[in-house]
Interface confidence: low
């Protein structure tokens, strides 16, 4: 029986070469066999004798199907020849690289010359499972990656019937996200917090931050997802660009802008009229030029009802007007730069606007009084009260009047009391507010009369003849009021005191016999008689009964005999 | 413009099978995730799973796991939840809706920006 | 836990303020998302993020979180603002997603 060859197998395929075994029928005397190997090609065939039933066959092409026949030799008789038809793999792929990366692709290209197709394996650092992608062009763009992670690609060449080259592996990492979401979580004068988020959620990341202003640029770069910046200018704009990278790739930066806060407002200066506040303060900043200040004006016990004024950029005085007289103000300054920036702190000053002075007021005499009433309506605004004051040559006194409200149109009066009587006053009256007073407002004032007081003496009969008299009498004290005449009254009534009435009668009404009363001589202050002495000089001699007239009073003779009494 | 289209209304008996389908358009359907949200009549939102329209890969709520199977075709732009051995208690409106990027697992939110209007399925013998 | 607890109904009169909130372990790693539903309609988008509104989305809803607690704020509430809100996140895993179970706001 002839020796049989079977079960040819290939191993090791390579693309240019296989290793041949096969099995013999007669197993014992395998080795006394040579094997004539035969291999035929799609254009070209060889042959090849070895001596054990194991060959190496070099020289083949890749991608290429061959029939391969093993015919086992013994002296000039051929055995049974055993057959294995076989595809070479293709050759490895050249020139495999990234030819473009961003947060969730990377492209790969490569080379190849015999591969029917190629095989991706993407496997994701750290991961166990990989996802296969199958291309028949020289070049893949593998999409849905995560950013920032590391990613291995295997391409194994897939050649004529399922036969696969050896692989190749390139790794490379996604580019980072960009972050997102930056904050700036507090910011003072001169430090920033910022915070960002990372989609990516990548420990290992590097954040490289650059900060710029137009003093210069500053780099710093961070592990975290925060950063403190320090040192920086009050009121001047950062720009701060944030930019991933791990293990050297850069993801796309993203930005935030942001103001320093400015420093606070000092020396804050106010001037004052009834209805209006001029402020103004200073600013040491180096960006004060672009400042503008925020005011807020709020009336001591309203702070609901507060003024806002905002001024121009690198202003630092302002008016503010529509204040009410005589009231207590505070204002806050803020400065303020960019977007509504502010500083953390406003300055702050206390003030109070001018209290309002009186228009005017009025002055009423009381009758028989030595007093007089002042009538005022009180000025607009707020007032503690007024000091009033009154004077007359050498004299003066001064008292504090309560104070009143100018809503409701009120009229408020006082009486000054204890004065003199037929006097003329100054009166000054100064509104008082928040310790400051206002102008004065002035007015004189006379106080008005009442019944002189009675004489120390009644007045003497100088001399009697049978007709007439002459009647002594001393003036009157002035003291109640200016005494304007005299009047001299005789009577034949009983004795008692006259009243006022009595003044309307004449010598006629005595005849007549309508009075017993009358009045005979009537004397003006100045029309009295001079007696020659200084001593006498307020001393008045009325010779009554000269039948003389005096303003429209007849001094008619006197009855011989009659009994008379004589007042003045 | 970007919309999400939805399969009509199914009824079917307990035991049965049911395949709701999605098509997208106005966007490319390969870059983004499609979830599955059900509501019981009268009841909340509840989240089914997703599929990457890339790559196939998929992620279940532990509730429907073994049930459910989410696929996609590409080519039409539709992604499909089908869901097996239905109860009384899976009678709801099924939504599909789209998640915009990131997707990644580390991400700090999850947005549904485009919803379908819904599928009723009813579960009745 | 890979819960979100939501309050079950809210009112409000209308023109005023008010405040849903959610709250779950998993909001103190991610932000909460919050959807408009009204009867018989698909829900919307309303608050993603931080405190982004999608466009066409009124400026007077806005969004807010602190630790474990996302709020949605309506200020000035209107009539057509009623409806259910549902807060969701991914769950403390990262990779599954969870819903609150729906505040239902009722506009006075």
């Known amino acids: 029986n002839a020796i049989q060859v079977f079960d040819v197998t290939a191993v090791n395929i390579s693309a240019t070469s296989l290793t041949l075994i096969w099995k013999v029928s007669d197993n014992e005397s395998s080795s006394n066999y040579t094997y004539k190997i035969h291999v035929a090609g799609e254009t070209d065939s060889s042959n090849l004798n070895v001596s054990e039933p194991r060959a190496v066959i070099p020289g083949l092409r890749s991608s290429t199907f061959y029939n391969i026949t093993v015919c086992p030799v013994l002296g000039d008789i051929e055995g049974t020849p055993g057959f294995l038809q076989v595809h070479t793999p293709p050759v490895p792929v050249s020139d495999f690289r990234v030819t473009v990366v961003s947060t969730t692709e990377i492209g790969l290209a490569w080379s190849s010359h015999d591969a029917e197709s190629f095989q991706m394996h993407i496997t994701q650092e750290g991961a166990g499972n990989s996802r296969v992608e199958i291309t028949t062009n020289q070049s893949i763009i593998i999409g849905g990656l995560f950013p920032g992670t590391k990613y291995c690609f295997e391409i194994v060449p897939k050649g004529p019937n399922g036969t696969e080259g050896a692989s190749r592996t390139v790794c490379n990492r996604t580019v980072p996200s960009a972050v997102f979401d930056i904050h700036v979580v507090y910011v003072t004068t001169t430090e920033m917090w910022l915070d960002w988020k990372s989609p990516d959620g990548a420990s290992e990341y590097v954040y490289h931050l650059v900060i710029e202003s137009k003093h210069g640029s500053n780099h710093t770069s961070t592990y975290d997802k925060a950063i403190t910046l320090q040192g920086l200018i009050p009121g001047t704009l950062y720009n701060i660009t944030i930019s991933p990278e791990v293990d050297h790739v850069w993801g796309d930066p993203n930005s935030t802008a942001q103001y320093t806060r400015p420093s606070n407002v000092s020396n804050i200066d106010v001037s004052t009229n009834t209805t209006a506040a001029t402020l103004s303060w200073q600013n040491f900043d180096d960006a004060s030029p672009t400042y503008s200040y925020c005011l807020l004006i709020e009336k001591a016990g309203n702070s609901s009802n507060a003024t806002q004024v905002v001024t121009d950029i690198g202003i630092t005085d302002a008016t503010v007007t529509e204040l009410i007289p005589g009231s207590s103000y505070t204002v806050e300054i803020f400065a303020q730069v960019g977007d509504g920036i502010k500083s953390l702190e406003p300055g702050r000053k206390s003030f109070c606007t001018d209290p309002a002075s009186m228009a005017s007021f009025d002055c009423e005499v009381v009758p028989k009084e030595p007093a007089l009433v002042l009538k005022w309506t009180c000025p607009p605004g707020a007032n503690a009260g007024f000091e009033l004051e009154v004077s007359s040559g050498a004299w003066n006194n001064a008292t504090h009047l309560e104070s009143c409200s100018s809503e409701n149109g009120t009229e408020y009066r006082t009486e000054v009391t204890y004065l003199n009587f037929s006097t003329s006053y100054n009166i000054s009256i100064t509104t008082v507010s928040c310790g400051k007073m206002a102008a004065p407002t002035r007015n004189t004032c006379t106080t008005g009369i009442t019944d002189p007081p009675p004489p120390d003496g009644s007045p003497n009969i100088t001399s009697v003849s049978h007709n007439s008299v002459k009647v002594k009498f001393s003036g009157f004290e002035a003291s109640h009021g200016p005494i304007k005449a005299y009047a001299v009254i005789l009577t034949t009534g009983e004795a008692g005191h006259p009243s006022a009435d009595v003044l309307k009668y004449t010598y006629e009404d005595f005849k007549k016999g309508a009075s017993d009363t009358y009045v005979t001589y009537l004397i003006r202050t100045e029309e009295k008689g001079r007696s020659q002495s200084l001593s006498e000089v307020l001393k008045y001699e009325i010779d009554v009964g000269n039948e003389s007239t005096t303003l429209g009073y007849y001094n008619g003779k006197l009855e011989p005999l009659g009994s008379y009494r004589a007042c003045v | 413009q970007v919309q999400l289209v939805q399969s009509g209304a199914e009824v079917k008996k307990p035991g049965a099978s049911v395949k709701v389908s999605c098509k997208a358009s106005g966007y490319t359907f390969t870059g983004q995730y499609i979830h599955w949200v059900r509501q019981a009549p009268g009841q909340g939102l509840e989240w089914m799973g997703w599929?990457?329209?890339?790559?196939?890969?998929?992620d279940y709520a532990q509730k429907v796991q073994g049930r459910v199977t989410m696929t996609t075709d590409t080519s039409t732009s539709t992604a499909y939840m089908e869901l097996r051995s239905l109860r009384s208690d899976d009678t709801a409106v099924y939504y599909c809706a789209r998640e915009v990027w990131p997707v990644a697992a580390a991400d700090t939110f999850s947005v549904f920006d485009i919803w379908g209007r819904g599928t009723l399925v009813t579960v009745s013998s | 836990s890979s819960e979100l607890t939501q309050d079950p109904a809210v009112s409000v009169a209308l023109g005023q303020t008010v405040r849903i909130t959610c709250q779950g372990d998993?909001?103190?790693?991610?932000?909460a998302s919050w959807y408009q539903q009204k009867p018989g309609q698909a829900p919307v988008l309303v608050i993603y993020g931080k405190n982004n509104r999608p466009s066409g989305i009124p400026d007077r809803f806005s969004g807010s979180s602190s630790g474990n607690t996302a709020s949605l704020t309506i200020t000035g509430a209107q009539a057509e603002d009623e409806a259910d809100y549902y807060c969701n996140s991914r769950d403390s895993s990262g990779n599954h997603v969870v819903f609150g179970g729906g505040t239902k706001l009722t506009v006075l």
């Open positions: 599929i990457s329209a890339y790559n196939g890969y998929t």
């Open positions: 998993s909001l103190r790693s991610y932000y």
